[in-house]
């Protein structure tokens, strides 16, 4: 019965970009301005997303698809479909409730977003510090002190930095 009824449902013939208008004997009416329907058979059209304030329009709304937003310069998207914008900071900083704050000594952030992470502990890998860390850059680990003894090769390529999230606190 359900299948038979759906086959006879005039609304199923309404394409994307229209809605089945109950006020007009279920004929297919175009979506009003600033609304859309992305699938056929819709009984209403959805209101278009408005990109305002920090949000910029990346893609205009059409009768068949919603608008898409991104963030104005100085901010970056968060969440599915850029549902939020979060402000950027400078490298060497992290965003807190009190705004952008410099990384504490022993931590770094080489991006405009995200948190300050601890410098790599070279000694955990038996290495020495070849280049000191800064607020903006991780330390560069070099050869172990034993490798620098007389007669040993003086330079070895730096070890790849450990995943910062796994660094010791």
């Amino acid at each position: 019965f359900e299948r038979t009824r759906s086959l006879q449902d005039p609304c199923s013939n309404c394409p994307a970009g229209t809605f089945c208008d109950n006020n007009r004997n279920q004929i297919c009416s175009p979506c009003p301005p600033n609304s859309f329907s992305s699938a056929g058979g819709q009984r209403t059209c959805d209101i278009c997303r408005q990109c305002k304030g920090v949000f910029r329009t990346r893609k205009e709304c059409s009768s068949t698809s919603n608008a898409e937003c991104d963030c104005t310069p100085g901010f970056h998207c968060l969440g599915a479909g850029c549902s939020m914008c979060e402000q950027d900071c400078k490298q060497g900083q992290e965003l807190t409730k009190k705004g952008c704050k410099d990384c504490c000594f022993g931590t770094f952030n080489d991006q405009k977003r995200g948190i300050c992470r601890p410098w790599t502990n070279c000694s955990l890998d038996g290495k020495s510090v070849l280049v000191n860390g800064t607020k903006e850059r991780d330390v560069v680990c070099g050869p172990s002190p034993a490798d620098l003894s007389p007669g040993a090769s003086s330079v070895t390529p730096p070890a790849p930095a450990r995943e910062p999230g796994h660094s010791p606190q």
């Epitope: 304030g53 920090v54 968060l78 549902s83 939020m84 914008c85 979060e86 965003l95 409730k97």
Partner: nanobody
Framework: EVQLVESGGGLVKPGGSLRLSCGAS????????MFWFRQAPGEGLEWVAN????????YYVDSVEGRFTISRDNAKNSLYLQMNSLRAEDTAIYYC????????????????WGQGTTVTVSS
């Protein structure tokens, strides 16, 4: 519909005061952090101040600390920015914004913004 509407902007002389208001509707205002941002002519958006759900935490950008006060009245679904000792460099469009879900736990994003109100400080 989730909405924020700012008001209270205008022309004021240096040293003067203004109080901006932001009316919220369509959501549970008392559940969200709230923000003021501003955009000076030809400049990018700048965070000005933010306030937690019950008003016990308030933070300000250094340039307005001691001159501006952010507050809220959850019973009236309203956010305020009291601006004293105004300077020419405070001239901007001021926006109120809502902190996104989960704000202060894992991110500091905003998801709903008003249309802005213009403040001009000039003699």
């Amino acid at each position: 519909e989730v909405q924020l509407v700012e008001s209270g902007g205008g022309l004021v002389k240096p040293g003067g005061s203004l109080r901006l208001s932001c009316g919220a509707s369509g959501f549970t205002f008392s559940s969200y952090w709230m923000f003021w941002f501003r955009q000076a002519p030809g400049e990018g958006l700048e965070w000005v101040a933010n306030i937690n759900q019950d008003g016990s935490e308030k933070y300000y950008v250094d340039s307005v600390e001691g001159r501006f006060t952010i507050s809220r009245d959850n019973a009236k679904n309203s956010l305020y920015l009291q601006m004293n000792s105004l300077r020419a460099e405070d001239t901007a469009i001021y926006y109120c914004a809502r902190g996104g879900d989960g704000y202060s736990d894992s991110h500091y994003g905003t998801d709903v913004w008003g249309q802005g109100t213009t403040v001009t400080v000039s003699s």
